[in-house]
Amino acid sequence: LNVKHTPKLEIKVTPSDAIVREGDSVTMTCEVSSSNPEYTTVSWLKDGTSLKKQNTFTLNLREVTKDQSGKYCCQVSNDVGPGRSEEVFLQVQYAPEPSTVQILHSPAVEGSQVEFLCMSLANPLPTNYTWYHNGKEMQGRTEEKVHIPKILPWHAGTYSCVAENILGTGQRGPGAELDVQYPPKKVTTVIQNPMPIREGDTVTLSCNYNSSNPSVTRYEWKPHGAWEEPSLGVLKIQNVGWDNTTIACAACNSWCSWASPVALNVQYA
């Protein structure tokens, strides 16, 4: 009985586990266990695409690179048709590439939680990480993710990381900037006039603050007098009356921070 069939194939990869390091060599042998009639052509495919000029029973890959990772198979044809081997998944291992940091999320609001993720292409996956804040190593942080449950202004700055696997240590990438936003800090209302203030004087007050992110864009004063609302942090009260007892200012960015009220102590003329 002469049963015609497409070639029956097996693929043998060297090394046997199909795991190699970048720069190593790999060989695949296409074994024809049976073919009726005799086979005529041999070809090799990677990820389903035919590899050019590869028409022998062996596929030799010299000094492999990571982009040669993938699924390989051989195809052998006879007059009945093509037979195809099972796929071999070639894994090319390499040391971590320069890492990048992803921040969830920046800008961050003071008091919120922030997560940093160190991303680095590597095979096998990195087993250890080193984190840096403004170039200084963050002690005790060796995981892929860093979680800060309550962000403070001093947490702002550049975060970078280095990934490490069994093949080596990657390079520190450019890092990512954490912007911490918060209301204006230490807002004070300051009376610029010499004391005492007399009824009918012109009083100048300034609204001062220590720091702010984003920048202060406006100021508010209370109580709301008949005076013109100034855009700068200076308030002039013309012809002050004895009933103008206390004044408070607020410096505002996305939030307003109010200073404690100050007493004018206006004296009768």
Epitope: E10, V13, S16, T29, C30, T56, F57, T58, E86, V88
Partner: antibody, heavy 118, light 113 residues
Framework: QVQVQQPGAELVRPGTSVKLSCKAS????????MYWVKQRPGQGLEWIGV????????YYNQKFKGKATLTVDTSSSTAYMQLSSLTSEDSAVYYC???????????WGQGTTLTVSS | DVVMTQTPLSLPVSLGDQASISCRSS???????????LHWYLQKPGQSPKLLIY???NRFSGVPDRFSGSGSGTDFTLKISRVEAEDLGVYFC??????????FGGGTKLEIK
């Protein structure tokens, strides 16, 4: 039919080099690997290296790196192994053999007896 | 490297007897593709080695059916059901699963008792 032919013997001086040949016939030379194996008198078999004639891809036994160099001439279907800096330790029978890729070695040459002597 | 150990070193037999040669590897010879690349060669006196069995149990072309191979993992056996005079010589096992390097057993000499 498949044939792998080797010269019977070579006599060389210590410190010199020798190039052993292995002529194949009866099949498509570039489709099969060519292995080289060393056998000292009364000893076992020791793999030296292998070459794929289709693209000159080679694997060497670490022990023979720097000692053996494998090449092929596809136009004459001949494989070569050059052995350098010869000493008496290199005196042995050297076989070339046709292999089915990295799977198994099917056909062996008759072997070349190399004698290194002054 | 995979170390191949053959026993016995020498095997005296009478013609017509059954002979059995053992080969043990230092690690499993099962390849990731499921095949086991363990082979047997016979080197007759004054000749080059000849392939008898490939991949544990497949007889090479022209090899008589009195030769059979078996085993799995790390333990393998070559059996000759009825030894003939032309079977005398040194038998080698070899592995090509974990390569390079391709490695051979030390050999078993089959001789007349």
């Amino acid at each position: 039919q498949v044939q792998v032919q080797q010269p019977g013997a070579e006599l060389v001086r210590p410190g010199t080099s020798v190039k052993l040949s292995c002529k194949a016939s009866g099949y498509t030379f570039t489709r099969y690997w060519m292995y080289w194996v060393k056998q000292r008198p009364g000893q076992g078999l020791e793999w030296i290296g292998v070459i794929d004639p289709s693209d000159n891809f080679t694997y060497y036994n670490q022990k023979f790196k720097g000692k053996a160099t494998l090449t092929v001439d596809t136009s004459s279907s001949t494989a070569y192994m050059q052995l350098s800096s010869l000493t008496s330790e290199d005196s042995a029978v050297y076989y070339c053999a046709r292999g089915y890729g990295s799977s198994y070695v099917g056909y062996w040459g008759q072997g070349t007896t190399l004698t290194v002597s002054s | 490297d995979v170390v191949m150990t053959q026993t016995p070193l020498s095997l005296p037999v009478s013609l017509g007897d059954q002979a059995s040669i053992s080969c043990r590897s230092s690690q499993s010879l099962v390849h990731s593709n499921g095949n086991t690349y363990l082979h047997w060669y016979l080197q007759k006196p004054g000749q080059s080695p000849k392939l008898l069995i490939y991949k544990v149990s497949n007889r090479f072309s022209g090899v008589p059916d009195r030769f059979s191979g078996s085993g799995s993992g790390t333990d393998f056996t070559l059996k000759i059901s009825r030894v003939e005079a032309e079977d005398l010589g040194v038998y080698f096992c070899s592995q090509s699963t974990h390569v390079p390097p391709w490695t051979f057993g030390g050999g078993t000499k089959l001789e007349i008792k």
